[in-house]
Amino acid sequence: MRRGPRSLRGRDAPAPTPCVPAECFDLLVRHCVACGLLRTPRPKPAGASSPAPRTALQPQESVGAGAGEAALPLPGLL
């Protein structure tokens, strides 16, 4: 489930960068793009063994603010 638009202001960012719900903020180009253009995280199927050296992303069990996906101030995340 994607989040709605969020204002994004980092300590290095000059201004807020809102993205509409279908868009994600691409840090490399520093603007909003369709989320489908970015490799957004996909859940790993249960019991699947991913081929080395693939390693999927997951938040740690205990996530501090700003460290895990749930705490990210980036818009349009899963």
């Epitope: 994004l8 202001r9 980092g10 300590r11 290095d12 960012a13 994600c24 903020f25 691409d26 840090l27 490399l28 180009v29 793009v33 489908g36 253009l37 970015l38 490799r39 957004t40 995280p41 693939r54 390693t55 999927a56 992303l57 740690q60 996530v63 501090g64 603010a65 700003g66 460290a67 895990g68 996906e69 705490a71 990210l72 101030p73 980036l74 995340l77």
Partner: antibody
């Protein structure tokens, strides 16, 4: 998702090194697709990327000699490094980062390219 | 470009011991409230393997003995109790801005 590098393992000095990375299980029209190299016994050096839109970025240290391109019909992206010398002997990896952390979680197994006459 | 300095270059430890690896950036790798600092493990003849992303988050399948901490310019990778398969080279990498850069690596070897 798998990445597989391919290309000649031996290149002569002053020639152009050409490598291809074939991606399966994901589309190169999504995300960033990178080349990284590692000189024997040394650390990792970032070469550059081609993005979902086809735009490219090259490490300034190699920019004058590097070209990264793609063939979306084959789901491949390629590296060309011109005017090679022995200092370009390295294992070349293709890799891709996930969003939103840009952490490279997809890697090819790497291919050793030796520059020698 | 952002320069990453890892220390020590080599760490000689025994299985079961705690390993503490350091990575220092020449400037902050924080942006938008995130530390864009990742850790990789590499064994001979293999591609690097992502261990930790965004400073403190374990990648899928990475054992709980691996943990990352830090923000800004100073980061630490800790292996709480070394297993035989943990002896390898570890690299930090920043993904805040291109060119993405790697530290010089820390080799964790058996004492």
């Amino acid at each position: 998702v798998q990445l597989q590098e391919s290309g000649p393992g031996l290149v002569k000095p002053s020639q152009t090194l050409s490598l291809t990375c074939t991606v399966s299980g994901d589309s190169i029209t999504s995300g960033y697709w990178n080349w990284i190299r590692q000189h024997p016994g040394k650390g990792l050096e970032y070469i550059g990327y081609i993005s979902y839109s086809g735009s490219t970025y090259y490490n300034p240290s190699l920019k004058s000699r590097v070209t990264i391109s793609r063939d979306t019909s084959k789901n491949q992206f390629s590296l060309k490094l011109s005017s090679v010398t022995a200092a370009d002997t390295a294992v070349y990896y293709c890799a891709s980062p996930n969003y939103p952390f840009y952490a490279m979680d997809y890697w090819g197994q790497g291919t050793l390219v030796t520059v020698s006459s | 470009e952002i320069v990453l300095t890892q220390s020590p270059a080599t760490l000689s430890l025994s299985p079961g011991e705690r390993a503490t690896l350091s990575c220092r950036a020449s400037e902050s790798v924080d942006n938008y409230g995130i530390s864009f600092l990742n850790w990789f493990q590499q064994k001979p003849g293999q591609a690097p393997r992502l261990l930790i992303y965004a400073a403190s988050n374990r990648a899928t399948g990475i054992p709980a003995r691996f943990s990352g901490s830090g923000s800004g310019t100073d980061f630490t990778l800790t292996i709480s109790s070394l297993e035989p398969e943990d002896f390898a080279v570890y690299y930090c990498q920043q993904s805040k801005e291109v060119p993405w850069t790697f530290g010089g690596g820390t080799k964790v070897e058996i004492k």
